[in-house]
Amino acid sequence: TQNKALPENVKYGIVLDAGSSHTSLYIYKWPAEKENDTGVVHQVEECRVKGPGISKFVQKVNEIGIYLTDCMERAREVIPRSQHQETPVYLGATAGMRLLRMESEELADRVLDVVERSLSNYPFDFQGARIITGQEEGAYGWITINYLLGKFSQKTRWFSIVPYETNNQETFGALDLGGASTQVTFVPQNQTIESPDNALQFRLYGKDYNVYTHSFLCYGKDQALWQKLAKDIQVASNEILRDPCFHPGYKKVVNVSDLYKTPCTKRFEMTLPFQQFEIQGIGNYQQCHQSILELFNTSYCPYSQCAFNGIFLPPLQGDFGAFSAFYFVMKFLNLTSEKVSQEKVTEMMKKFCAQPWEEIKTSYAGVKEKYLSEYCFSGTYILSLLLQGYHFTADSWEHIHFIGKIQGSDAGWTLGYMLNLTNMIPAEQPLSTPLSHSTYV
């Protein structure tokens, strides 16, 4: 008689990434009997929640439940009903909520309390909502990309199953860019990690890893822009800010109260003789780059070497996966190809920033103006951060791989977070067993 397949024995997990600019829900799936194998967990769904990040709900916490509804209902549809009660749900909030907590623990707690109450109303196994540390965000991003790239597998293969695979067990570094923070995480080459706060030790699948990580709070692309505006308005002669990071002909009115709302601009805060100012774009890459560099204090370093702001950074080592906004911005600018050199990227940015705003709007008619207007700044910021902040060079640029997905799963911290919380990354290498007998009868 012919073998008949039994119902799939699978498990699911849900992670919500509550970022500074938006929330995304990810659904993961894996074969129940292969929990400890490397590379078996994969993403089956991503649902982007409509609206801003949860930290923006301080004045309207009663709207949080509605905000989360669509994506939680989507999860209800995707995951079989029989699995609902055993599907764990985790929410991790990142730098946007770290900044809110810095301003007020009470307000951050209130937002998280309402989020928890809303998520508890669903039939899943809700495991809690918390603000993850910058160190966790960096570490889990590193775990995610190396798990998906098969770097933790001890089996060497004669063929490549994933892009970027160099068929060795050298891990990739992780470069993550969000709206409010950016993380750099990698295994340095035989280098002492001089700052204990930046050192992580892992034992994964029987191998030890000494990992460097740092999260730069306020250096995500949105908060970096607020910082730059706050810095530049200090020296403006009136309420017009001629800004090289915006296209020629672009105009936007900014409220000073909005500018000083974030702790990120605290060092630039001053009493201004006006309540509003107008940004007028002049579209000059070189001047924009120079303005951005002023956000990085490189004059002080208490270690053998630093990134910026006195933060230790070991010499860069190996290949890096650059994901989240590193990828989204570079993808929009059509600069993610492995063949595009750093010099070429700079040239393209010069041309892009110099294009008149009216022309840009026509060329990208389908893109929201708020986002469209900021690509010149964001692209320039990415170059400045990678080259001057992290000390990549024209030569080492080829070691940066702009990654959106690996094997269908988004690069980011959420998968690593779930793998850790569900204990699916063993410290020791699991004993290899013959083919499982549970699949067919």
Epitope: R101, M102, S104, E105, R110, T133, L217, P263, C264, R267
Partner: antibody, heavy 115, light 111 residues
Framework: QVQLVQSGAEVKKPGASVKVSCKAS????????MHWVRQAPGQRLEWMGY????????TFNQKFKGRVTITVDTSASTAYMELSSLRSEDTAVYYC?????????WGQGTLVTVS | DIVMTQSPDSLAVSLGERATINCRAS??????????MYWFQQKPGQPPKLLIY???NQGSGVPDRFSGSGSGTDFTLTISSLQAEDVAVYYC?????????FGGGTKVEIK
């Protein structure tokens, strides 16, 4: 666990300056503001100001403006409060406290005597 | 500045009895649905210890006999059953507005 350890007692002459340190451990130093509060003998607690260790931005009680400076050394996870032009009424115990709006963790206090 | 007025200045209560301390703010200390009101306990030679935050939430490791209530301008700290180790000075504080301000303190003793 979160700990804030302050420098030792100081005796100063009127007109001099004093600099008190507060070393933090058990958390990410740049994730929380650091406040300074003082308490003169038999008096109520008095908030002096705070610093955002992340970038060195600070806010002060107007009463102390111009006399108080708050700084940080992030590599040493340490905050400093310097009070200048000391007078006898500045004799007090000076505390650092971690928080945004909730002062959940306090240093042990530093007695500054001006005489 | 928001002025915080505590009453009474001192309080003598028998062991096991209830102690009630009041704090009035010169203007509302509520914002975004949160009361930025805190209660601290201070024993001689020690820093203040956070008892209550957000008007009614217990601080970490604080015994259940301590509770807080109120909103807007009027707040109360209650010790449901006074213990010997509760002898201390109690302060209220607001952090709604800079400068953050404290009450004058209430000294709690055993009768």
């Amino acid at each position: 666990q979160v700990q804030l350890v302050q420098s030792g007692a100081e005796v100063k002459k009127p007109g001099a300056s004093v600099k008190v340190s507060c070393k933090a451990s058990g958390y990410t130093f740049t994730d929380y503001n650091m406040h300074w509060v003082r308490q003169a003998p038999g008096q109520r607690l008095e908030w002096m100001g705070y610093i955002v260790p992340l970038n060195g931005g600070s806010t002060f009680n107007q009463k102390f403006k111009g006399r108080v400076t708050i700084t940080v050394d992030t590599s040493a996870s340490t905050a400093y409060m310097e009070l200048s032009s000391l007078r006898s009424e500045d004799t007090a115990v000076y505390y650092c406290a971690r928080g945004g709006t909730r002062f959940a963790y306090w240093g042990q206090g530093t007695l500054v005597t001006v005489s | 500045d928001i002025v915080m007025t505590q009453s009474p200045d001192s309080l003598a209560v028998s062991l096991g009895e209830r102690a009630t301390i009041n704090c009035r703010a010169s203007e509302s200390v509520d914002n975004f649905g949160v009361s930025f009101m805190y209660w601290f306990q201070q024993k001689p030679g020690q820093p203040p210890k956070l008892l209550i935050y957000g008007a009614s939430n217990q601080g970490s490791g604080v015994p259940d006999r301590f509770s807080g209530s109120g909103s807007g301008t009027d707040f109360t700290l209650t010790i449901s059953s006074l213990q010997a180790e509760d002898v201390a000075v109690y302060y209220c504080q607001q952090t709604k507005e800079v400068p953050y301000t404290f009450g004058g303190g209430t000294k709690v003793e055993i009768k």
